[in-house]
Amino acid sequence: FGISGRHSITVTTVASAGNIGEDGILSCTFEPDIKLSDIVIQWLKEGVLGLVHEFKEGKDELSEQDEMFRGRTAVFADQVIVGNASLRLKNVQLTDAGTYKCYIITSKGKGNANLEYKTGAFSMPEVNVDYNASSETLRCEAPRWFPQPTVVWASQVDQGANFSEVSNTSFELNSENVTMKVVSVLYNVTINNTYSCMIENDIAKATGDIKVTESEIKRRSHLQLLNSKA
């Protein structure tokens, strides 16, 4: 790799997850250099025959880029000088999951760090009152998940209660034949209570809350990536 420095420099990565079909970021920072032309960034993926991305002398150098990444990668060129080597990955694929290496060469030396990149699908759930049902029923829907998640209902009033006997969850494959729509129905709902629909797989955990009173309905959703320091 034509090493320009003798010393080791600090390179820092952050494990992250990509949502398939969307754009993702592989985070990497390093001790900055004063000259852009002295900085080389190489992104590699374990077990891949070509490079993921290379940036040197102030521009992309993609002659040895692996075909699986062609047209899908970019660094933040204007931020390289301040030590940002993060990679933007367009249209994340399930097969992009794996171990990546961010390899940096500057006039100060060289360094590298690995990161685990998980891929899947995750989306925010929405909880609504199902007025079509014969009894008071809540319907929790999330459009895109992969791998298949677990769904658990909880309630503020009946903390610790097991709602598996009074709920029904289904998974419907989406048109691209990878991700699935999650639908969970909770029966025998009482008013003046807050219910939570929690959807979780090994990549993300999402919660949809609904507070049902006689006068109003309040909703709130939250999504958190797992095994990621981001």
């Epitope: 790799f1 190489q42 077990g47 025959l49 490079l51 097969t95 290496k101």
Partner: antibody, heavy 122, light 107 residues
């Protein structure tokens, strides 16, 4: 100890199909790309195909493109080569070999199987 | 596709001789070149990778040099066990190509 063991070779008629397998052990299989290399009787080595560690990328020599399909099952530590529309010139000993782990940083083709003979003849 | 041309295709040498085999790529492959040794009925054995890096366990009499398009494998003092066929292989990005081989025979 790293071991690669090919199987599935044999005699097949022109136009026929065959599926080769390569069982790997002694290393983290999913961390490495894997390749198939063949050698016709009395001839040199010819790289046939490769597949990335996760299976997301496949690569082929022009001579087999559209006829051969490489795949892997990381849960079984096994590499495959599905060979269709076989021709007499495909007759060779087929080797599986451990390919690269990190581009530019690691050795490649450092471990080979013992080979399996494929004969295409009527 | 990148073509690899090896020369000579065969050579006769004696034990103790210095042997040089050359390999030329049809376009620059930087240092992405490996050398293999193969004996009859056996699988090839990796000797050199990245043009000049000696694989573990390979005797130091084997050495490789070159970059870009021109590469050399040198055996400094030929030993009886070195009589075999030698292949170069390029691994530039996602293609791999072998040279046609050089057979080293006993004079």
């Amino acid at each position: 100890e790293v071991q690669l063991l090919e199987s599935g070779g044999g005699l097949v008629q022109p136009g026929g199909s065959l599926r080769l397998s390569c069982a790997a052990s002694g290393f983290t299989f999913s961390s490495y790309a894997m390749s198939w290399v063949r050698q016709a009787p009395g001839k040199g080595l010819e790289w046939v195909s490769a597949i990335s560690g996760g299976g997301g990328s496949t690569y082929y020599a022009d001579s087999v493109k559209g006829r051969f399909t490489i795949s892997r099952d990381n849960s079984k530590n096994t590499l495959y080569l599905q060979m269709n529309s076989l021709r007499a010139e495909d007759t060779a000993v087929y080797y599986c070999a451990r390919d690269i782990q990190w581009f530019g940083e690691s050795t490649l083709f450092d471990y080979w199987g013992q080979g399996t003979l494929v004969t295409v003849s009527s | 596709d990148i073509q690899m041309t090896q020369s000579p295709s065969s050579l006769s040498a004696s034990v103790g001789d210095r042997v040089t085999i050359t390999c030329r790529a049809s376009q620059s492959i930087r240092s992405w070149l490996a050398w293999f040794q193969q004996k009859p009925g056996k699988a090839p054995k990796l000797l050199i990778y990245k043009a000049s890096s000696l694989e573990g366990g390979v005797p130091s009499r084997f050495s490789g040099s070159g970059s870009g398009t021109d590469f050399t494998l040198t055996i400094s003092s030929l030993q009886p066990e070195d009589f075999a066929t030698y292949y170069c292989q390029q691994y530039n990005s996602y293609s791999r190509t072998f040279g046609q081989g050089t057979k080293v025979e006993i004079k």
